[in-house]
């Protein structure tokens, strides 16, 4: 979808943290991906290509992230109840043109079993 709920599993829990998966089409060569919590920018990653097809990856708001050929994963650690919120992947596509913006998201539910450092 261009704007709406992610039609894939956006949140992957492990070890008291969460991997937030932001997908983009394979065809996209240059882009900016922002992770929004509500309306606040938590993380961003920009991929551009320079002369000779050299790839540049930049982050203005750095989070631990992982880039693949069709997704960016942002990692949040030490989960607690304050992390429960709507999260959005805000994708700005520069190449191929035209410049396009898509927003997909979902609600991150926090359950006791997913919290970090529980007392057993």
């Amino acid at each position: 979808e261009i704007n709406g709920s992610a039609n894939y599993e956006m949140f992957i829990f492990h070890n008291g943290g969460v991997q937030i998966l932001c997908k983009y089409p394979d065809i996209v060569q240059q882009f900016k991906m922002q992770l929004l919590k509500g309306g606040q920018i938590l993380c961003d990653l920009t991929k551009t290509k320079g002369s000779g097809n050299t790839v540049s990856i930049k982050s203005l708001k750095f989070c631990h992230s992982q880039l693949s050929n069709n997704s960016v994963s942002f990692f949040l650690y030490n989960l607690d109840h304050s992390h429960a919120n709507y999260y959005f992947c805000n994708l700005s596509i520069f190449d191929p043109p035209p410049f396009k913006v898509t927003l997909t998201g979902g609600y991150l539910h926090i359950y006791e079993s997913q919290l970090c450092c529980q007392l057993k």
């Epitope: 979808e1 261009i2 089409p25 065809i27 700005s92 596509i93 520069f94 191929p96 043109p97 035209p98 410049f99 396009k100 913006v101």
Partner: antibody, heavy 122, light 106 residues
Framework: QVQLLESGGGLVKPGGSLRLSCAAS????????MNWIRQAPGKRLEWVSY????????YYVDSVRGRFTVSRDNAKNSLYLQMNSLRAEDTAVYYC???????????????WGQGTTVTVSS | DIQMTQSPSTLSASVGDRVTITCRAS??????LAWYQQKPGKAPKLLIY???SLEGGVPSRFSGSGSGTEFTLTISSLQPDDFATYYC????????FGQGTKVEIK
């Protein structure tokens, strides 16, 4: 009101040059990416060139790359298309068209000029 | 390159008819599709963007649907002003237009 007005078309011999202009009014020109689109007689519309709002990102259709140069002057609210080494197959009506806003992205080409006719013939 | 194919090429209809034009893309373009109306000697006019969003000022009798590779433009009740040529355009990767569908008076 929001308007685009092309000029500069005409009759030119093969191998010749023309410079098309597109004057924008009624909106903040520097906020928008722009296109040149052409339509040969009786044919479908064909995208020719695209330029970002700042002028730093430019794309061309393969058939004109190396011959045509797109540029813009945001201070003058103007878009240009310099056409060199013209061929008979470049004969068409040329339109400038407004495209993506630099924040919200593309929602189609929502404003078009009236077109200017380029005829390449000996 | 992504190819766009419209059908039919010509459509004969009467005022009040419901008209449907189909556009197929050679590969999936998600919902990055626009529809334009063009009258002889005039510039195209944007009707629909993002496959189904109605451009401001366009009458509600026009609607668009579809995603992926198959899209439709529907005119619910054809009016005299609607006789024109209609083009679909993909903007998923660069821009390509369909060959056009001429809606003429029956």
């Amino acid at each position: 009101q929001v308007q685009l007005l092309e000029s500069g078309g005409g009759l030119v011999k093969p191998g010749g040059s023309l410079r098309l202009s597109c004057a924008a009014s009624g909106f903040t020109f520097s906020d928008y990416y722009m296109n040149w689109i052409r339509q040969a007689p009786g044919k479908r519309l064909e995208w020719v060139s695209y330029i970002s709002n700042s002028g730093t990102t430019i794309y061309y259709v393969d058939s004109v790359r190396g011959r045509f140069t797109v540029s813009r002057d945001n201070a003058k609210n103007s878009l240009y298309l310099q056409m060199n080494s013209l061929r008979a197959e470049d004969t068409a009506v040329y339109y400038c068209a407004r495209d993506a806003h630099y924040v919200s992205g593309s929602e189609g080409m929502d404003v078009w000029g009236q077109g200017t006719t380029v005829t390449v013939s000996s | 390159d992504i190819q766009m194919t419209q059908s039919p090429s010509t459509l004969s209809a009467s005022v009040g008819d419901r008209v449907t034009i189909t556009c197929r893309a050679s590969q999936s373009i998600s919902s990055w599709l626009a529809w334009y109306q063009q009258k002889p000697g005039k510039a195209p006019k944007l009707l629909i963007y993002k496959a189904s969003s109605l451009e401001g000022g366009v009458p509600s009798r026009f609607s668009g649907s579809g995603s992926g590779t198959e899209f439709t433009l529907t005119i619910s009740s054809l009016q005299p002003d609607d006789f024109a040529t209609y083009y679909c355009q993909q903007y998923y990767s660069y821009w390509t237009f369909g060959q056009g569908t001429k809606v003429e008076i029956k």
